[in-house]
């Protein structure tokens, strides 16, 4: 479907064409349930709440409504060269028995997440492959998406910025231009313990050292790769427990938010690191607000009830520009008996080094 937001003069400032699939985990009296449904063809733009952004005060937003009070919102932001969907939020009404049969709660829920939907100014964002955005108990997948904000003439621009998934991955990446002052390689990060608890007790136990590997363009147009350690002494942890999604959210030094999302394969009873999202500030970058996300990972896997352990350094590639180096990881998600790690499943790297 095509969605459009117009300004007072009738000129479109946001145009978006995509199909969307929702996967929502919710509780019923007989236990957790997962519902999947598509954005219906009669979904409409909420004109009163969508906006081209008021001068100097707010950014453009597209609010799409469907069903009995459900809304999907895309909030945009921009700088001199790029724009992005800074935040996607989904409000869903569990009293809609058509979409959420037998829901034990009838409340209205709100979930939101940063996204990696971004494009050059004056070009449209194009993504034929599915773009997944994970938000607590909800996953939204956009298919065949063409999105553009900050328009002035009610039509998509000729040029486009393709999403990461659509781009062919080169067999050998071109070398990055030399950086005038390469960052010194930091020492291994400190290992810290993290736990997330919900109404049913602990759903995540983790011990690990975290290092961010970031590649970005600086203001002088040189490309630099930096390694940043997450300092446990300057990091606060929070999270949430769900039947199908466990999240660990780390806020570090006031400028970095790192989100880990663990999923579960019900048929094989295995948990795994499914998604990583990063939101940080790089003062020397051409675009200081660095954001990256990937919700299709399959890392740190173990059987539910057991723990995953790896003494070797693990590299989890999130995007072309961002990976996480995880040191001495020991993690267990969903089922944590007595707040203690269960039987250990060693990583292949450790087994091979024995």
């Amino acid at each position: 479907a095509m969605f459009m937001v117009k300004n007072g003069q009738g000129t479109a400032c946001i145009m978006a064409q995509f199909s969307a699939a929702f996967s929502v985990n919710y509780d019923t009296k007989s236990g957790p349930k997962q519902m999947t449904f598509d954005l219906p063809s009669d979904a409409t733009v909420v004109l009163q709440r969508s906006s081209c952004g008021k001068e100097q005060t707010s950014d453009p937003s597209l609010v799409i409504a469907f069903g009995r009070g459900h809304t999907l919102t895309l909030n945009f932001t921009r700088n001199a060269t790029r724009y992005s969907v800074q935040l996607m939020s989904f409000v869903y009404n569990l009293s809609d028995t058509h979409l959420f049969p037998n829901a034990s709660s009838k409340e209205i829920k709100t979930v939101e997440s940063i996204t990696d939907i971004r494009a050059d100014i004056d070009k449209k964002y194009r993504c034929v492959s599915g773009t997944q955005v994970h938000m607590n108990n909800v996953t939204v997948t956009l298919h065949d998406a063409t999105i553009q904000a900050y328009l002035s003439n009610s039509s998509f621009s000729r040029g486009e910025t393709r999403c990461e998934q659509d781009r062919p991955s080169p067999t050998t990446a071109p070398p990055a231009p030399p950086s005038p002052s390469p960052s010194p390689v930091p020492k291994s990060p400190s290992v810290d313990k993290y736990n997330v608890s919900g109404t049913n007790g602990t759903c995540l136990l983790a011990s690990m050292g975290l290092q961010l590997n970031l590649t970005y363009e600086r203001k002088d147009n040189t490309t630099v790769t930096r390694l940043l350690n997450i300092n446990p002494n300057k990091t606060s942890a929070s999270g949430s427990c769900g039947a199908h999604l466990v999240t660990l959210e780390l806020h570090s030094e006031g400028t970095t938010v790192l989100l880990f999302q663990f999923g579960m394969n019900a048929s094989s009873s295995r948990f795994f690191l499914q998604g990583i999202q990063l939101n940080t500030i790089l003062p020397d970058a051409r675009d200081p607000a660095f954001k990256a996300a990937n919700g299709s990972l399959r890392a740190l896997q173990a059987t539910v009830g057991n723990s995953y352990k790896c003494n070797a350094e693990e590299h989890v590639r999130v995007t072309k520009a961002f990976s996480v180096n995880i040191f001495k990881v020991w993690v267990q998600a969903f089922k944590v008996e007595g707040g203690q790690f269960g039987s250990v499943e060693e990583c292949l790297l450790d087994e091979n080094s024995m």
Epitope: E55, Q56, A80, T81, D120, D122, K123, L151, S157, R158
Partner: antibody
Framework: QVQLQQSGAELVKPGASVKMSCKAS????????IHWVKKSPGQGLEWIGA????????PYSQKFKDKATLTADKSSSTTYMQLSRLTSEDSAVYYC???????????WGQGTLVSVSA | DIQMTQSPPSLSASLGGKVTITCKAS??????MAWYQDKPGKGPRLLIH???TLQPGIPSRFSGSGSGRDYSFSISNLEPEDIATYYC????????FGGGTKLEIK
């Protein structure tokens, strides 16, 4: 209609700095980048940098990153460019320019002549 | 930064004749190419954007073409007022001007 009004000519000494202005009118100031372009007999037209007044983000050409500083004042719809450590090479006409979305540089100020001389 | 190599630096042609200027980008610029006319004492004037789209009010004697890294600009049926310096500009990735071509009439 879109108008870009630049400040007057400047005669400055080598080593000094100069700050010129570009006042925009006829459109929503925070919706468009303002670019600065140098025109000199020896080098022709050169793109210096741009600023997005909405948040002050300013990418620069590699050549001018240590020479020029771009700022914007939303309350007066004015963009400024400061040039530092001036030499005779910096003697030129400097234009502020607004792009018309994806139609390149469509609107030009009248230019500010900077003469660097002892 | 993307580099733009414009040639020739200068050229001389007869009234009524035709001239062609070329610009080569250091990488593919996806047809985000514009051409400007610059006369002494005046500000540069946008003639063509998006490689081949004429700005309103620009005579059809001016034309542009190209793709990828290679672009060209032509003026046919030269007139005296065409004496100027012409510049290409890429705006696919940041912004870069070519070195300019000074056009003189024989």
């Amino acid at each position: 209609q879109v108008q870009l009004q630049q400040s007057g000519a400047e005669l400055v000494k080598p080593g000094a700095s100069v700050k010129m202005s570009c006042k925009a009118s006829g459109y929503i100031f925070t919706n468009y980048n303002i670019h600065w372009v140098k025109k000199s007999p020896g080098q022709g037209l050169e793109w210096i940098g741009a600023i997005y007044p909405g948040n002050g983000d300013a990418p620069y050409s590699q050549k001018f990153k240590d020479k020029a500083t771009l700022t914007a004042d939303k309350s007066s719809s004015t963009t400024y460019m400061q040039l530092s450590r001036l030499t005779s090479e910096d003697s030129a006409v400097y234009y502020c320019v607004r792009a018309n979305w994806d139609v390149a540089f469509a609107y030009w100020g009248q230019g500010t002549l900077v003469s660097v001389s002892a | 930064d993307i580099q733009m190599t414009q040639s020739p630096p200068s050229l001389s042609a007869s009234l009524g004749g035709k001239v062609t200027i070329t610009c080569k980008a250091s990488q593919d610029i996806d047809r985000y190419m514009a051409w400007y006319q610059d006369k002494p004492g005046k500000g540069p004037r946008l003639l063509i954007h998006d490689t081949s789209t004429l700005q309103p009010g620009i005579p059809s004697r001016f034309s542009g073409s190209g793709s990828g890294r290679d672009y060209s600009f032509s003026i046919s049926n030269l007139e005296p007022e065409d004496i100027a310096t012409y510049y290409c500009l890429q705006y696919d990735n940041l912004w870069t001007f070519g070195g300019g071509t000074k056009l003189e009439i024989k």
